[in-house]
Interface confidence: low
Protein backbone atom coordinates (compact mmCIF):
# COMPACT_ATOMS: atom_id res chain seq x y z
CA UNK A 1 0.00 0.00 0.00
CA UNK A 2 1.37 3.41 -0.95
CA UNK A 3 0.43 6.29 1.29
CA UNK A 4 -0.50 9.14 -1.05
CA UNK A 5 1.72 12.21 -1.36
CA UNK A 6 -1.21 14.19 0.06
CA UNK A 7 -0.79 12.24 3.29
CA UNK A 8 2.69 13.67 3.75
CA UNK A 9 1.44 17.17 2.99
CA UNK A 10 -1.42 16.63 5.44
CA UNK A 11 1.08 15.77 8.15
CA UNK A 12 2.92 19.02 7.55
CA UNK A 13 -0.35 20.96 7.58
CA UNK A 14 -1.23 19.29 10.89
CA UNK A 15 2.06 20.44 12.39
CA UNK A 16 1.47 23.97 11.10
CA UNK A 17 -2.00 24.01 12.64
CA UNK A 18 -0.60 22.81 15.95
CA UNK A 19 1.91 25.67 15.80
CA UNK A 20 -0.84 28.18 15.04
CA UNK A 21 -2.99 26.94 17.92
CA UNK A 22 -0.57 28.43 20.44
CA UNK A 23 -2.44 30.81 22.72
CA UNK A 24 0.01 31.57 25.47
CA UNK A 25 3.75 31.58 25.86
CA UNK A 26 5.29 28.21 26.61
CA UNK A 27 7.96 30.20 28.46
CA UNK A 28 5.42 31.26 31.05
CA UNK A 29 4.64 27.57 31.59
CA UNK A 30 8.13 26.14 32.04
CA UNK A 31 7.30 25.03 35.57
CA UNK A 32 4.45 22.92 34.16
CA UNK A 33 6.64 21.02 31.72
CA UNK A 34 6.38 17.29 32.06
CA UNK A 35 8.07 14.27 30.54
CA UNK A 36 5.21 12.11 29.25
CA UNK A 37 7.57 9.36 28.16
CA UNK A 38 6.80 9.28 24.47
CA UNK A 39 7.48 5.65 23.41
CA UNK A 40 10.13 6.62 20.88
CA UNK A 41 11.41 3.06 20.57
CA UNK A 42 8.01 2.00 19.20
CA UNK A 43 8.62 4.32 16.25
CA UNK A 44 12.07 3.01 15.38
CA UNK A 45 13.14 2.29 11.82
CA UNK A 46 13.43 -1.42 12.54
CA UNK A 47 9.70 -1.87 11.93
CA UNK A 48 8.27 -3.42 8.82
CA UNK A 49 5.64 -1.36 7.04
CA UNK A 50 2.97 -3.89 8.05
CA UNK A 51 3.71 -3.15 11.68
CA UNK A 52 3.99 0.61 11.46
CA UNK A 53 0.67 1.39 9.79
CA UNK A 54 -1.50 0.32 12.77
CA UNK A 55 0.83 2.07 15.25
CA UNK A 56 0.67 5.31 13.27
CA UNK A 57 -3.09 4.91 13.02
CA UNK A 58 -3.33 4.52 16.80
CA UNK A 59 -1.17 7.61 17.33
CA UNK A 60 -3.37 9.79 15.11
CA UNK A 61 -6.58 8.32 16.52
CA UNK A 62 -5.43 9.15 20.04
CA UNK A 63 -4.53 12.73 19.03
CA UNK A 64 -7.99 13.02 17.48
CA UNK A 65 -9.61 11.73 20.70
CA UNK A 66 -7.55 14.06 22.88
CA UNK A 67 -8.48 17.18 20.93
CA UNK A 68 -12.15 16.21 20.44
CA UNK A 69 -13.12 16.51 24.10
CA UNK A 70 -15.24 19.38 25.37
CA UNK A 71 -12.31 20.52 27.51
CA UNK A 72 -10.23 20.79 24.35
CA UNK A 73 -12.96 22.72 22.54
CA UNK A 74 -12.91 25.25 25.37
CA UNK A 75 -9.12 25.60 25.19
CA UNK A 76 -8.51 26.16 21.49
CA UNK A 77 -9.66 28.34 18.62
CA UNK A 78 -12.71 26.66 17.06
CA UNK A 79 -11.75 27.40 13.44
CA UNK A 80 -8.22 26.03 13.86
CA UNK A 81 -9.59 23.02 15.73
CA UNK A 82 -12.00 22.23 12.89
CA UNK A 83 -9.18 22.40 10.35
CA UNK A 84 -7.08 20.22 12.65
CA UNK A 85 -9.85 17.58 12.86
CA UNK A 86 -10.17 17.58 9.07
CA UNK A 87 -6.43 16.95 8.58
CA UNK A 88 -6.37 14.18 11.19
CA UNK A 89 -9.50 12.57 9.74
CA UNK A 90 -7.94 12.51 6.28
CA UNK A 91 -4.78 10.91 7.63
CA UNK A 92 -6.82 8.28 9.47
CA UNK A 93 -8.62 7.52 6.21
CA UNK A 94 -5.31 7.13 4.34
CA UNK A 95 -3.97 4.73 6.97
CA UNK A 96 -7.24 2.79 7.18
CA UNK A 97 -7.18 2.33 3.40
CA UNK A 98 -3.76 0.71 3.80
CA UNK A 99 -5.01 -1.61 6.53
CA UNK A 100 -8.02 -2.60 4.39
CA UNK A 101 -5.69 -3.37 1.48
CA UNK A 102 -4.14 -6.03 3.68
CA UNK A 103 -1.14 -4.33 5.20
CA UNK A 104 -0.82 -5.57 8.76
CA UNK A 105 -3.93 -7.78 8.79
CA UNK A 106 -2.53 -11.14 7.72
CA UNK A 107 -0.70 -11.53 11.03
CA UNK A 108 -0.82 -9.44 14.16
CA UNK A 109 2.66 -9.68 15.64
CA UNK A 110 2.82 -9.38 19.41
CA UNK A 111 5.39 -6.61 18.97
CA UNK A 112 2.83 -4.51 17.09
CA UNK A 113 0.20 -5.04 19.81
CA UNK A 114 2.72 -4.00 22.45
CA UNK A 115 3.50 -0.88 20.42
CA UNK A 116 -0.17 0.08 20.18
CA UNK A 117 -0.53 -0.46 23.92
CA UNK A 118 2.53 1.74 24.57
CA UNK A 119 0.95 4.54 22.50
CA UNK A 120 -2.33 4.20 24.41
CA UNK A 121 -0.52 4.37 27.75
CA UNK A 122 1.34 7.47 26.59
CA UNK A 123 -1.96 9.23 25.87
CA UNK A 124 -3.36 8.02 29.19
CA UNK A 125 -0.45 9.80 30.90
CA UNK A 126 -1.26 12.97 28.96
CA UNK A 127 -4.96 12.76 29.87
CA UNK A 128 -4.12 12.17 33.53
CA UNK A 129 -1.75 15.16 33.51
CA UNK A 130 -4.49 17.42 32.11
CA UNK A 131 -6.92 16.21 34.77
CA UNK A 132 -4.38 16.77 37.55
CA UNK A 133 -3.68 20.26 36.22
CA UNK A 134 -7.44 20.91 35.96
CA UNK A 135 -7.14 21.61 32.22
CA UNK A 136 -5.31 24.86 32.90
CA UNK A 137 -4.10 27.00 29.95
CA UNK A 138 -0.50 26.11 30.79
CA UNK A 139 -1.30 22.39 30.94
CA UNK A 140 -2.89 22.57 27.50
CA UNK A 141 0.07 24.53 26.14
CA UNK A 142 2.49 21.91 27.46
CA UNK A 143 0.35 19.18 25.89
CA UNK A 144 0.14 21.03 22.57
CA UNK A 145 3.94 21.30 22.46
CA UNK A 146 4.30 17.64 23.40
CA UNK A 147 1.84 16.48 20.72
CA UNK A 148 3.66 18.62 18.19
CA UNK A 149 6.90 16.90 19.16
CA UNK A 150 5.54 13.35 19.15
CA UNK A 151 3.52 13.86 15.97
CA UNK A 152 6.68 15.20 14.37
CA UNK A 153 8.53 12.03 15.35
CA UNK A 154 5.80 9.81 13.90
CA UNK A 155 5.76 11.92 10.73
CA UNK A 156 9.46 11.21 10.35
CA UNK A 157 8.65 7.52 10.51
CA UNK A 158 6.12 7.92 7.70
CA UNK A 159 8.75 9.71 5.62
CA UNK A 160 11.32 7.00 6.26
CA UNK A 161 8.75 4.38 5.20
CA UNK A 162 8.16 6.26 1.97
CA UNK A 163 11.89 6.59 1.25
CA UNK A 164 12.44 2.86 1.79
CA UNK A 165 9.92 1.93 -0.92
Amino acid sequence: CDLPQTHSLGSRRTLMLLAQMRRISLFSCLKDRHDFGFPQEEFGNQFQKAETIPVLHEMIQQIFNLFSTKDSSAAWDETLLDKFYTELYQQLNDLEACVIQGVGVTETPLMKEDSILAVRKYFQRITLYLKEKKYSPCAWEVVRAEIMRSFSLSTNLQESLRSKE
Epitope: A19, Q20, R22, S25, L26, F27, S28, L30, R33, D35, F38, Q40, A145, M148, R149, S152, L153
Partner: antibody, heavy 118, light 107 residues
Framework: QVQLVQSGAEVKKPGASVKVSCKAS????????IHWVRQAPGQGLEWMGW????????GYAQKFQGRVTMTRDTSTSTVYMELSSLRSEDTAVYYC???????????WGQGTLVTVSS | DIQMTQSPSSLSASVGDRVTITCRAS??????LNWYQQKPGKAPKLLIY???SLESGVPSRFSGSGSGTDFTLTISSLQPEDFATYYC?????????FGQGTKVEIK
Amino acid sequence: QVQLVQSGAEVKKPGASVKVSCKASGYTFSNYYIHWVRQAPGQGLEWMGWMDSNSGGTGYAQKFQGRVTMTRDTSTSTVYMELSSLRSEDTAVYYCAKEVFSGWYDYWGQGTLVTVSS
Amino acid sequence: DIQMTQSPSSLSASVGDRVTITCRASQSISSYLNWYQQKPGKAPKLLIYAASSLESGVPSRFSGSGSGTDFTLTISSLQPEDFATYYCQQSYSTPYTFGQGTKVEIK
Protein backbone atom coordinates in the same frame (compact mmCIF):
# COMPACT_ATOMS: atom_id res chain seq x y z
CA GLN B 1 10.62 30.88 1.26
CA VAL B 2 11.40 31.74 4.87
CA GLN B 3 14.07 34.38 5.30
CA LEU B 4 15.53 36.31 8.21
CA VAL B 5 17.57 39.26 6.99
CA GLN B 6 19.70 41.12 9.51
CA SER B 7 21.15 44.61 9.46
CA GLY B 8 24.79 45.25 8.57
CA ALA B 9 27.97 45.17 10.64
CA GLU B 10 28.50 47.79 13.35
CA VAL B 11 31.56 49.23 15.08
CA LYS B 12 30.88 50.76 18.49
CA LYS B 13 32.84 52.34 21.30
CA PRO B 14 32.74 50.88 24.83
CA GLY B 15 29.74 52.21 26.77
CA ALA B 16 27.67 52.79 23.61
CA SER B 17 24.55 50.89 22.49
CA VAL B 18 23.84 48.91 19.36
CA LYS B 19 20.51 48.02 17.78
CA VAL B 20 20.41 45.07 15.40
CA SER B 21 17.36 44.39 13.24
CA CYS B 22 16.00 41.11 11.88
CA LYS B 23 13.40 41.28 9.12
CA ALA B 24 11.28 38.15 8.70
CA SER B 25 9.51 37.03 5.54
CA GLY B 26 7.99 33.91 4.03
CA TYR B 27 5.90 32.87 7.04
CA THR B 28 3.21 34.19 9.39
CA PHE B 29 5.29 36.51 11.57
CA SER B 30 3.02 36.43 14.64
CA ASN B 31 2.94 32.63 14.88
CA TYR B 32 6.55 32.18 15.91
CA TYR B 33 9.06 33.40 18.44
CA ILE B 34 12.35 34.98 17.45
CA HIS B 35 15.39 34.24 19.59
CA TRP B 36 18.77 35.92 19.65
CA VAL B 37 22.03 33.99 19.91
CA ARG B 38 25.52 35.42 19.77
CA GLN B 39 28.94 34.03 18.96
CA ALA B 40 32.20 35.67 19.97
CA PRO B 41 35.11 35.23 17.50
CA GLY B 42 36.32 31.63 17.58
CA GLN B 43 33.91 30.79 20.40
CA GLY B 44 30.69 28.83 20.86
CA LEU B 45 27.05 29.90 20.75
CA GLU B 46 25.41 31.85 23.56
CA TRP B 47 21.66 32.28 23.96
CA MET B 48 20.50 35.80 24.77
CA GLY B 49 16.72 35.69 24.90
CA TRP B 50 13.41 35.47 23.06
CA MET B 51 10.70 37.69 21.69
CA ASP B 52 7.10 36.61 21.18
CA SER B 53 6.30 38.17 17.81
CA ASN B 54 2.58 38.01 18.59
CA SER B 55 2.28 39.53 22.07
CA GLY B 56 5.59 41.36 22.25
CA GLY B 57 6.52 39.37 25.35
CA THR B 58 10.20 38.84 26.02
CA GLY B 59 12.53 36.71 28.10
CA TYR B 60 16.21 37.42 28.58
CA ALA B 61 19.13 35.40 29.86
CA GLN B 62 20.09 36.60 33.35
CA LYS B 63 23.52 37.54 32.04
CA PHE B 64 22.02 40.21 29.76
CA GLN B 65 19.19 41.36 32.03
CA GLY B 66 19.14 45.14 32.25
CA ARG B 67 21.37 45.55 29.19
CA VAL B 68 19.30 43.95 26.46
CA THR B 69 15.95 45.03 25.02
CA MET B 70 14.06 43.14 22.34
CA THR B 71 11.22 44.81 20.47
CA ARG B 72 9.24 44.18 17.32
CA ASP B 73 7.41 46.07 14.59
CA THR B 74 4.54 43.91 13.32
CA SER B 75 3.87 46.23 10.38
CA THR B 76 7.27 45.39 8.89
CA SER B 77 7.69 41.91 10.48
CA THR B 78 10.93 43.09 12.05
CA VAL B 79 12.44 42.22 15.42
CA TYR B 80 15.09 44.38 17.07
CA MET B 81 17.72 43.57 19.66
CA GLU B 82 19.35 46.47 21.46
CA LEU B 83 22.37 45.91 23.69
CA SER B 84 23.58 48.80 25.84
CA SER B 85 26.70 49.57 27.92
CA LEU B 86 28.83 47.73 25.41
CA ARG B 87 32.20 46.33 26.41
CA SER B 88 34.94 44.68 24.41
CA GLU B 89 33.69 41.19 25.32
CA ASP B 90 30.41 41.96 23.52
CA THR B 91 32.31 41.78 20.22
CA ALA B 92 30.50 38.96 18.47
CA VAL B 93 28.29 37.90 15.59
CA TYR B 94 24.65 38.31 16.65
CA TYR B 95 22.10 35.95 15.12
CA CYS B 96 18.34 36.04 15.14
CA ALA B 97 16.64 32.67 14.78
CA LYS B 98 13.06 31.55 14.20
CA GLU B 99 11.87 29.09 16.80
CA VAL B 100 9.73 26.21 15.57
CA PHE B 101 8.62 25.59 19.15
CA SER B 102 10.15 24.58 22.41
CA GLY B 103 13.57 25.98 21.68
CA TRP B 104 14.70 24.70 18.34
CA TYR B 105 15.47 26.95 15.41
CA ASP B 106 14.77 26.03 11.82
CA TYR B 107 15.85 29.33 10.24
CA TRP B 108 18.62 31.74 11.19
CA GLY B 109 19.58 35.22 10.05
CA GLN B 110 22.93 35.63 8.29
CA GLY B 111 24.41 37.22 11.41
CA THR B 112 25.50 40.75 12.28
CA LEU B 113 29.06 41.40 13.40
CA VAL B 114 29.23 43.94 16.22
CA THR B 115 32.74 45.11 17.04
CA VAL B 116 33.33 47.00 20.29
CA SER B 117 36.61 48.84 20.23
CA SER B 118 37.98 52.10 21.55
CA ASP C 1 21.83 27.10 34.53
CA ILE C 2 22.10 23.74 32.80
CA GLN C 3 25.63 22.99 31.62
CA MET C 4 26.11 21.11 28.36
CA THR C 5 29.36 19.22 27.90
CA GLN C 6 30.32 17.92 24.47
CA SER C 7 33.01 15.40 23.69
CA PRO C 8 35.33 15.27 21.99
CA SER C 9 36.08 18.95 21.41
CA SER C 10 37.61 18.00 18.06
CA LEU C 11 38.17 14.90 16.00
CA SER C 12 39.84 13.92 12.75
CA ALA C 13 38.07 11.52 10.46
CA SER C 14 38.04 10.35 6.87
CA VAL C 15 35.25 10.33 4.30
CA GLY C 16 33.13 7.22 4.89
CA ASP C 17 33.92 7.01 8.61
CA ARG C 18 31.23 6.61 11.24
CA VAL C 19 31.43 9.55 13.62
CA THR C 20 29.88 9.82 17.08
CA ILE C 21 29.65 12.99 19.16
CA THR C 22 28.31 12.91 22.69
CA CYS C 23 26.64 15.59 24.75
CA ARG C 24 25.96 15.45 28.48
CA ALA C 25 23.60 17.71 30.41
CA SER C 26 24.26 18.65 34.04
CA GLN C 27 20.70 17.61 34.89
CA SER C 28 17.90 15.70 33.18
CA ILE C 29 16.49 17.53 30.17
CA SER C 30 14.10 14.79 29.01
CA SER C 31 14.47 14.88 25.22
CA TYR C 32 14.74 18.66 24.82
CA LEU C 33 18.06 18.39 23.02
CA ASN C 34 18.88 19.75 19.57
CA TRP C 35 21.91 19.43 17.30
CA TYR C 36 23.25 22.08 14.93
CA GLN C 37 25.95 22.09 12.28
CA GLN C 38 27.96 25.25 11.64
CA LYS C 39 30.45 25.99 8.89
CA PRO C 40 32.92 28.88 9.05
CA GLY C 41 31.30 32.26 8.42
CA LYS C 42 27.82 30.75 8.28
CA ALA C 43 24.84 30.58 10.62
CA PRO C 44 24.16 27.28 12.40
CA LYS C 45 21.89 24.77 10.68
CA LEU C 46 19.40 22.56 12.52
CA LEU C 47 20.08 18.84 12.09
CA ILE C 48 18.24 17.05 14.88
CA TYR C 49 15.56 18.31 17.25
CA ALA C 50 13.90 16.68 20.26
CA ALA C 51 16.93 14.37 20.64
CA SER C 52 16.17 12.14 17.67
CA SER C 53 13.94 13.89 15.12
CA LEU C 54 15.66 14.53 11.82
CA GLU C 55 14.99 18.00 10.49
CA SER C 56 13.36 18.10 7.06
CA GLY C 57 15.95 18.09 4.26
CA VAL C 58 18.78 16.77 6.45
CA PRO C 59 20.43 13.60 5.06
CA SER C 60 19.48 10.36 6.81
CA ARG C 61 23.14 9.62 7.62
CA PHE C 62 22.62 11.97 10.59
CA SER C 63 20.87 10.50 13.59
CA GLY C 64 20.40 11.42 17.21
CA SER C 65 19.64 9.40 20.30
CA GLY C 66 19.44 9.71 24.05
CA SER C 67 17.20 10.98 26.79
CA GLY C 68 17.69 12.44 30.24
CA THR C 69 21.31 13.52 30.50
CA ASP C 70 23.22 11.61 27.80
CA PHE C 71 22.83 12.21 24.09
CA THR C 72 24.60 11.17 20.91
CA LEU C 73 24.84 12.54 17.39
CA THR C 74 25.96 9.95 14.85
CA ILE C 75 27.04 10.47 11.25
CA SER C 76 26.87 6.98 9.75
CA SER C 77 29.14 7.68 6.79
CA LEU C 78 31.00 10.98 6.81
CA GLN C 79 30.76 12.99 3.59
CA PRO C 80 33.07 15.84 2.44
CA GLU C 81 30.35 18.43 3.20
CA ASP C 82 30.05 17.20 6.81
CA PHE C 83 33.36 18.69 7.92
CA ALA C 84 32.13 21.42 10.27
CA THR C 85 31.54 22.23 13.93
CA TYR C 86 28.62 20.57 15.69
CA TYR C 87 26.77 22.00 18.69
CA CYS C 88 24.23 20.46 21.02
CA GLN C 89 21.69 22.73 22.69
CA GLN C 90 19.27 22.11 25.52
CA SER C 91 15.84 23.70 25.30
CA TYR C 92 14.46 22.28 28.52
CA SER C 93 14.78 25.43 30.56
CA THR C 94 15.96 28.98 30.06
CA PRO C 95 18.62 30.13 29.67
CA TYR C 96 18.96 27.72 26.77
CA THR C 97 22.55 26.58 26.67
CA PHE C 98 24.83 25.12 24.02
CA GLY C 99 27.70 22.70 24.25
CA GLN C 100 31.15 24.12 23.50
CA GLY C 101 31.15 22.50 20.06
CA THR C 102 32.89 19.60 18.35
CA LYS C 103 35.02 20.37 15.33
CA VAL C 104 35.10 17.55 12.77
CA GLU C 105 38.25 17.84 10.66
CA ILE C 106 39.65 15.92 7.70
CA LYS C 107 42.23 13.31 8.65
